[in-house]
């Protein structure tokens, strides 16, 4: 039944960028200005998103796709489809409801967004701290203390330090 109905449904022939116009014997009419249809067979076109105020237009609306917005510099996108703009902070800070605040000792943030995260605990991997951490950078772990002791038969080169600060946003 479904297949029979779709074969008989003239609207299924209307491509993206058009709508099936009931007022005109179900012929395919182009989407009006400032509207779009991203799939075929639609009976209406959707209104284009308007990037107003601090939302800037990243991609213009077309007859087949909605506009895409981003945020004015100083803020960054948050939420699905950039539904919100959130304040940037400096590296070494995190955003709170009181504004941007410096990372506490023992934590860092190497980005303009996100939260301060604890420095890597090198000793958990049996390694020593090669470079101390800062508010902006994680510690760099070096060889284990045993590897550095005098008379050690062989010193293996330290494993490359992991790239810090790439936690999922």
């Amino acid at each position: 039944f479904e297949r029979t109905r779709s074969l008989q449904d003239p609207c299924s022939n209307c491509p993206a960028g058009t709508f099936c116009d009931n007022n005109r014997n179900q012929i395919c009419s182009p989407c009006p200005p400032n509207s779009f249809s991203s799939a075929g067979g639609q009976r209406t076109c959707d209104i284009c998103r308007q990037c107003k105020g601090v939302f800037r237009t990243r991609k213009e609306c077309s007859s087949t796709s909605n506009a895409e917005c981003d945020c004015t510099p100083g803020f960054h996108c948050l939420g699905a489809g950039c539904s919100m703009c959130e304040q940037d902070c400096k590296q070494g800070q995190e955003l709170t409801k009181k504004g941007c605040k410096d990372c506490c000792f023992g934590t860092f943030n190497d980005q303009k967004r996100g939260i301060c995260r604890p420095w890597t605990n090198c000793s958990l991997d049996g390694k020593s701290v090669l470079v101390n951490g800062t508010k902006e950078r994680d510690v760099v772990c070096g060889p284990s203390p045993a590897d550095l002791s005098p008379g050690a038969s062989s010193v293996t080169p330290p494993a490359p330090a992991r790239e810090p600060g790439h936690s999922p946003q």
């Epitope: 601090v54 948050l78 939420g79 539904s83 919100m84 703009c85 959130e86 304040q87 955003l95 709170t96 409801k97």
Partner: nanobody
């Protein structure tokens, strides 16, 4: 339609005062954190102040502390910014913005913004 409309901007001399207003409509104003954000000519956005749902929590950027006061009247669905001792560096477009659903828990995004009102501080 969810809307924020700012008013009260204008030209004022250094040391003068202005009171900005923001009229909210289309949503339950008293359920949301609200903020003022500004954009100086040729610069990025800068958060100025925010206020929680019942007005018991207010926070300010350091550069305006002691000079600006944020307030709200939930019965009138209105947000205000009293600006005293104005300086040339306060010249900017001032936006009223609504905090998103998760504001103050994990994210501080603002999802509804007004069109802005211009404040010019000049002698």
């Amino acid at each position: 339609e969810v809307q924020l409309v700012e008013s009260g901007g204008g030209l004022v001399q250094p040391g003068g005062s202005l009171r900005l207003s923001c009229a909210a409509s289309g949503f339950t104003f008293s359920n949301y954190w609200m903020s003022w954000v500004r954009q100086a000519p040729g610069r990025g956005l800068e958060w100025v102040a925010n206020i929680n749902q019942d007005g018991s929590e207010k926070y300010y950027v350091d550069s305006v502390k002691g000079r600006f006061t944020i307030s709200r009247d939930n019965a009138k669905s209105s947000l205000y910014l009293q600006m005293n001792s104005l300086r040339a560096e306060d010249t900017a477009v001032y936006y009223c913005a609504r905090g998103g659903e998760e504001y103050s828990s994990s994210h501080y995004g603002m999802d509804v913004w007004g069109q802005g009102t211009t404040v010019t501080v000049s002698s």
